[in-house]
């Protein structure tokens, strides 16, 4: 087999002989195909999915995953015991709660068993990769004639989370956003009784217990107020969106992460 490596512009090339089964140990000129990047997400500190894009392999390859924790009591190399598959090819590994140690450096190694020297190691801070479940049990209560309070629950993580509340009326083009700290409640001081309000919340593992960038999925929306403005076109759009959300959530397991956030990296 003859493999050639080009520079990124595709114009210059240098050819080397490259054997998938027996790579020469004394040759530094051989360039091995890079392994795909592993992306890990810890879901509500209940389980973790570490996934990779198996489609980037030029031939079907069941890559294997090993992991350990650096400089800790858990530094023994572990084999993946629960692989995730895409078209019968390994594309991820699921680790259970007992295997997750948020505050130790997680080392993950991907390897090509057909060519053991083809391997890549990454170090990850798991506390920055936590994605909580969507907030639940949204409730609204009237504090005064014009003031509303929104409350919600998060499963398990509570004080570790910050939140983002979005609300809009049936006359609004876009959402109004408000950041909320770990206290999972939000007050709207001035409510127009003639309008219908929709609220939703998402949460993030930040900043008290970690520095995660990814938000949870949005909660189910909750509504407050008048239903009288049916002639308003924005209301119809809003209701159609709500219907879509409801239908999605009825079907099977709740999707954890929006597709634009995670692309293909989230597996169930």
């Amino acid at each position: 087999l003859n493999t050639t490596i080009l520079t990124p512009n595709g114009n210059e090339d240098a050819t080397t002989d490259f054997f998938l089964t027996s790579m020469p140990t004394d040759s530094l000129s051989v360039s091995t195909l890079p392994l795909p990047e592993v992306q890990c997400f810890v879901f509500n500190v209940e389980y973790m999915n570490c996934t990779w894009n198996s489609s980037s392999e030029p031939q079907p390859t069941n890559l294997t995953l090993h992991y350990w924790y650096k400089n800790s009591d858990n530094d023994k190399v572990q084999k993946c015991s629960h692989y995730l598959f895409s078209e019968e090819i390994t594309s991820g590994c699921q680790l259970q709660k007992k295997e997750i140690h948020l505050y130790q450096t997680f080392v993950v190694q991907l390897q090509d068993p057909r060519e053991p020297r083809r391997q890549a190691t990454q170090m990850l801070k798991l506390q920055n990769l936590v994605i909580p479940w969507a907030p639940e049990n949204l409730t609204l209560r009237k504090l005064s004639e014009s003031q509303l309070e929104l409350n919600w629950n998060n499963r398990f993580l509570n004080h570790c989370l910050e939140h983002l509340v979005q609300y809009r009326t049936d006359w609004d083009h876009s959402w109004t956003e408000q950041s909320v700290d770990y206290r999972h409640k939000f007050s709207l001081p001035s409510v127009d009784g003639q309008k219908r309000y929709t609220f939703r919340v998402r949460s993030r593992f930040n900043p008290l217990c970690g520095s995660a960038q990814h938000w949870s999925e949005w909660s189910h929306p909750i509504h407050w107020g008048s239903n009288s403005s049916k002639e308003n076109p924005f209301l119809f759009a809003l209701e159609a969106e709500q219907k879509l959300i409801s239908e999605e959530d009825l079907g099977g397991e709740q999707k954890l992460i929006s597709e634009e956030d995670l692309h293909h990296h989230h597996h169930h």
């Epitope: 003859n2 490596i5 080009l6 198996s54 489609s55 980037s56 030029p58 031939q59 079907p60 019968e88």
Partner: antibody, heavy 122, light 108 residues
Framework: QVQLQQSGPGLVKPSQTLSLTCDIS??????????WNWIRQSPSRGLEWLGR?????????DYAVSVKSRITINPDTSKNQFSLQVNSVTPEDTAVYYC????????????WGQGTLVTVSS | DIQMTQSPSSLSASVGDRVTITCRAS??????LNWYQQKPGKAPKLLIY???SLQSGVPSRFSGSGSGTDFTLTISSLQPEDFATYYC??????????FGQGTRLEIK
């Protein structure tokens, strides 16, 4: 919808160089899941895979042993195409040449060029 | 390299017949076996991928089975448009990608 459009001469003299180009639409030659292949077909050899190029943070090429000393496959990112060159051709290289795309994780040729009959003759 | 051997190399059949073409790999290729149909002057067309999955738009009279080294393509009831040449192809261990030598299906 991916389409592959081949171009190049249909007649090449012995000992000269065969050159074909495959224009890609609906995908990028720099895709990180595709491989871009050349295949030829003749009555004596059947369907014969010649080689491929693919981008995975840099460019890679694989060639069939039977032609590796004479073949070059090059991507051209600016034109979103890839090309085939076969040097020192003989009448044995007379065949219909196809370009084709393969992608994971299923690894089949779903998209093919229309084919170019190349005759090697003086 | 993995060699792919198809049999028969040609066969004659009538419209409505059930036809089976076999493909054998020189070593195990799991289920990484694809079947193509080719008509004169045209590029091969994918029929079956991953040994048994029907490509979108392909009539259900085509089916594939097998894994490891032995595979079959079956046409349950031949139609006039099915008379063509059929090829198997492995993508388990590449490069090289290898094809069977083809089975020519003719009208009896």
């Amino acid at each position: 919808q991916v389409q592959l459009q081949q171009s190049g001469p249909g007649l090449v003299k012995p000992s000269q160089t065969l050159s074909l180009t495959c224009d890609i639409s609906g995908d990028s030659v720099s895709s990180n899941i595709a491989t871009w292949n050349w295949i030829r077909q003749s009555p004596s050899r059947g369907l014969e895979w010649l080689g491929r190029t693919y981008y995975r943070s840099k460019w890679y090429k694989d060639y069939a042993v039977s032609v590796k000393s004479r073949i070059t496959i090059n991507p051209d990112t600016s034109k979103n195409q890839f090309s085939l060159q076969v040097n020192s051709v003989t009448p044995e290289d007379t065949a219909v040449y196809y370009c084709a795309r393969m992608t994971g994780p299923r690894y089949y040729f779903e998209y093919w060029g229309q084919g170019t009959l190349v005759t090697v003759s003086s | 390299d993995i060699q792919m051997t198809q049999s028969p190399s040609s066969l004659s059949a009538s419209v409505g017949d059930r036809v089976t073409i076999t493909c054998r790999a020189s070593q195990s290729i799991s289920s990484y076996l694809n079947w193509y149909q080719q008509k004169p002057g045209k590029a091969p067309k994918l029929l079956i991928y991953a040994a048994s999955s029907l490509q979108s738009g392909v009539p259900s009279r085509f089916s594939g089975s097998g894994s490891g080294t032995d595979f079959t393509l079956t046409i349950s009831s031949l139609q006039p448009e099915d008379f063509a040449t059929y090829y198997c192809q492995q993508s388990y261990s590449t490069p090289p990608i290898t094809f069977g030598q083809g089975t020519r299906l003719e009208i009896k």
